[in-house]
């Protein structure tokens, strides 16, 4: 299936040009998306091209500026947030990145009624997290690991927690491992729907071992960065959840929410919190051995001013074939009765589907079914449930938005997006206004991305929000590669792949092949999305064929494929890449003497193991920031898939699955190993150990480190990295410079 046909005709050939590496590094062909900042059922805010904050009312068709770019610029604001009562805006400046989601910033409060900044009781700096209450203009913020509350922006703050301490106790914000591997947010506090209560997590990292690495900077002596970071099998953070009444915060103070007994009996995690009403909250907990999850619904007891979580409101989710959930355990979406909910989990056939839980999980009513997966529940209204899935035409790498009418019986299903722009758009997400009165659809491809606004009742398109016209025009004289998404059937396993082919691809010729791999559990690389990136350039200008293959362990094709890698990472992911390469060779257009593989992070691990597989298939390969041993990676992630590195659990496979154990096998391949020295995620230690093992085995290899760079290798390092990798591959494939 050719998703992006080449537009090359003989008459045009002279004016068409190939992509250059410079195009990619400059972001010449990057696209824009439009996500409305919804403030009601029919209004949204958007930052205009000239940086004014503009309010749009869909029903009146009117728009007006509420905050000028001059005000934004006066404090160098890069972000803003309107209070729900529409009286104030916080302006965020001095953004300073910490980890993947976390950052600190300076916040100013601007009073829209009088056009002035709020003076008196200004916020301290830098703040770790700040948010408005869902109603009115209360503020909750985290400063120096403690939580503060303001009833109004100009009021003095009320301090909620006092035990916060850097790298020891975190209140309202996650520690490193919870941020990266469990919550995937920079915050760990949640307002109740009307702002009566504020729930928050406290993480105690006192006993967690610390990862320490040098940050070289410009000083005479390097700094040492210390992060409490639990590696596989190490001591984990201790979590507690508290709730405080924000109307009378001093009255009884924070009340702890009890942990379900079956969870509290051994090491556990808190996985998410969902408010149902102002006096009902839902907490999700997970055993350290992550195949048992408990959803606990708790109620406020006015008489005792405490939170009660009856056993009858505990719902257990257990996996017998793998871990609980997909990448994370799914979160519930509550219905209007404030007790029943919709949730995605595996059905009896091993496919993730939407279920409706009214009393017990055992009596759950299955809402969707089939040999495909429901991926996200966007919104539940009185009469509709909106969700995304990969059902349409049986392509796992697509995403369409569906509406199920839950108000009628039997419920009817409608695909909202399947036929909108069928060739251009096969991978959607959505953003809904209050009560789903309107929604925005954001299409990521395979054609040029487009964002549109729709009526939530009729699904009618109202207007185009962003169609990337400039990008479309810029690409008119570019020879883009062709892309196809197909599947291989091998030993009862379906291997979907994406192949990126040079513009003048000719099946009768032979081409060098580059495999790009990620391959981590519950990931998906073969997606129907638009991208003009490094591999597009390699196909367009350098004449390479690039392939991405989703093997065992990848997501959205059922539990059999997903959980195949359970407790044995590094085996089937590698086998399936190798199997695919053999199939590609059989297709007849691959030069089998010029095959390479590359990957980043988990992909660096897989590419390293593939190069060291002893098959002789690969001439060369690159590993960027690879994991080299699962004993070096984070507990929450690693143990989910591998269990514990103990003798009575899975230590043997932890030892067998290292890159270092295969050092000898790198002798007959050209290996480029790359890592940032300040990688807080996959520590430089991983590559240091690979390099040591290769040196000890007297195996030649190439390496590049990036001083003071983290897992993302951003900024100027990006340019250097891709230039360096390009040279390496061109040399490997004997392509002239």
């Amino acid at each position: 299936i050719v998703l992006r046909p080449s537009r090359v005709h003989n008459s045009e050939e002279n004016t068409m040009r190939a992509l250059t590496l410079k195009d990619i590094l400059n972001g010449t062909f990057s696209y824009k998306t439009f996500f409305p900042n919804w403030i009601s059922g029919q209004e949204y805010l958007h930052q205009s091209a000239d940086n004014n904050i503009v309010l749009y009312n869909i029903e009146t068709g009117q728009s007006y500026t509420i905050l000028s770019n001059r005000t934004m610029k006066s404090v160098n604001a890069s972000n803003y947030g309107l209070s729900p009562d529409r009286q104030f805006v916080y302006l965020e400046s001095d953004y300073s990145k910490l980890w993947r989601y976390s950052y600190t910033a300076t916040y100013y409060i601007y009073d829209l009624s009088n056009g002035e900044f709020v003076r008196g009781n200004e916020l301290p700096r830098p703040i770790q997290y700040l948010c408005w209450s869902p109603v009115g203009s209360k503020l909750a913020y985290v400063y120096q690991n403690n939580i503060y509350l303001k009833q109004r922006p100009g009021d003095p703050p009320f301090q909620i927690t006092f035990n916060g301490r850097e790298n020891k106790i975190f209140n309202g914000i996650p520690d490193w491992v919870y941020e990266e591997e469990m919550l995937a947010t920079k915050y760990a506090l949640w307002w109740s729907p009307n702002g009566k209560f504020l729930a928050y997590a406290e993480f105690n990292d006192t006993d967690i071992p610390v990862i320490a690495y040098s940050y070289y900077g410009d000083e005479q002596y390097p700094r040492t960065i210390n992060i409490p970071y639990p590696k596989a099998g190490a001591k984990n953070p201790v979590v507690r959840i508290f709730i405080i009444d924000t109307t009378y915060p001093a009255y009884v103070g924070p009340q702890e929410v009890p942990v379900p007994a079956m969870i509290a009996s051994s090491d556990y995690y808190f996985s998410w919190l969902t408010w149902v009403t102002d006096e009902r909250v839902c907490l999700q907990w997970l055993k350290r051995v992550q195949n048992v999850s408990v959803l606990s619904i708790c109620d406020f007891r006015e008489d005792w001013q405490t939170w009660d979580c009856p056993k009858t409101q505990e719902h257990i989710e257990e996996s017998r074939t793998g871990w609980a959930g997909g990448f994370f355990v799914s979160t519930p979406v509550f219905s209007y009765d404030a007790i029943s909910y919709y949730k995605i989990f595996s059905d009896k056939d091993g496919y993730k589907h939407i279920h409706y839980i009214k009393d017990t999980v055992e009596n759950a009513i299955q809402i969707t079914s089939g040999k495909w997966e429901a991926i996200n529940i966007f919104r539940v209204t009185q009469d509709s449930l909106f969700y995304s899935s990969n059902e349409f035409e049986e392509y796992p790498g697509r995403r369409n938005i569906y509406r199920i009418s839950i108000g009628s019986y039997p419920p009817s299903k409608k695909c909202v997006t399947c036929h909108l722009r069928k060739e251009r758009c096969q991978y959607y997400t959505a953003s809904f206004s209050d009560y789903a009165k309107y929604y925005a659809l954001v299409c990521y491809g395979p054609g040029i991305p487009i964002s549109t606004l729709h009526d939530g009742r009729t699904d009618q398109e109202i207007k185009i929000l962003e169609e990337n016209k400039e990008l479309e025009n810029a690409l008119k004289n570019i020879q883009l590669p062709k892309e196809e998404i197909k599947k291989l059937e091998v030993d009862e396993i379906t291997l979907w792949y994406k192949m990126i082919l040079p513009p003048q691809f000719d099946r009768s010729k032979k081409y060098p092949l580059l495999i790009q791999v990620y391959g981590g559990p519950c990931s998906q690389s073969v997606r129907s999305v638009f991208a003009v990136n490094w591999i597009s350039y390699l196909a367009s200008k350098e004449g390479m064929v690039i392939a991405l293959v989703d093997g065992r362990g990848t997501a959205f094709q059922g539990d059999k494929l997903l959980y195949a890698v359970y407790r044995k990472l590094g085996v089937y992911e590698v086998e399936d890449q190798i199997t695919a390469v053999r199939k590609f060779i059989e297709m007849g257009f691959i030069d089998e003497k010029r095959i390479a593989i590359w990957g980043w992070s988990y992909g660096g691990y897989v590419s390293s193991l593939a190069l060291a597989s002893g098959t002789g298939l690969f001439k060369c390969g690159i590993a960027v920031a690879p994991v080299s041993s699962w004993e070096y990676y984070a507990s929450v992630y690693t143990e989910r898939f591998m269990g514990l590195p103990t003798k009575d659990d899975n230590l043997e496979h932890y030892k067998n699955s290292t890159v270092m154990a295969r050092a000898e096998y790198f002798r007959n391949v050209d290996y480029l190993l790359i890592h940032g020295t300040a990688d807080d995620n996959v520590h430089f230690q991983n590559s240091a150990q690979i390099a040591k093992a290769l040196v000890n085995a007297q195996v030649d290899f190439q390496a590049m480190w990036y001083s003071d760079q983290n897992h993302g290798l951003s900024g100027l390092s990006t340019n250097h990295l891709y230039t360096h990798m390009t040279h390496f591959l061109k040399q490997c494939f004997s392509l002239s410079d």
Epitope: S40, G41, Q42, N57, E59, I66
Partner: nanobody, 115 residues
Framework: QVQLQESGGGLVQAGGSLRLSCTVA????????MGWYRQAPGKRREWVAT???????NYADSVKARFTISRDNAKNTVYLQMNSLKPEDTAVYYC?????????WGQGTQVTVSS
């Protein structure tokens, strides 16, 4: 520049009532969220009440249960019914969208409450 014309102010004794009107020019529709604001002598302008696009109303604590905001879509007019007036309600009253449209304030209407 959006035209907003406030009227209905005056001098009233404490405990009395007034009804303020705000007529909005074509360029803005009162079906947008609209608000009343006031500025007392020597003080900053402050928010008083809002009526949302959906018709929900919100009030500053100081006027709750005494003031009522409403609108007439056909006349493109927003109202503020003020009962049980107090001397501290003395101010110039303005209407605007909520949040306010930048640089678009009318002349306002003076409300004076004598004790």
């Amino acid at each position: 520049q959006v035209q907003l014309q406030e009227s209905g102010g005056g001098l009233v004794q404490a405990g009395g009532s007034l009804r303020l009107s705000c007529t909005v020019a074509e360029s803005i529709d009162v079906r947008n969220a609209m608000g009343w604001y006031r500025q007392a002598p020597g003080k900053r302008r402050e928010w008083v009440a809002t009526i949302t696009t959906g018709g929900r109303t919100n009030y500053a604590d100081s006027v709750k249960a005494r003031f009522t905001i409403s609108r007439d879509n056909a006349k493109n007019t927003v109202y503020l019914q003020m009962n049980s007036l107090k001397p501290e309600d003395t101010a110039v009253y303005y209407c605007n969208a909520a949040p306010p449209i930048l640089n678009s304030w009318g002349q306002g209407t003076q409300v004076t409450v004598s004790s």
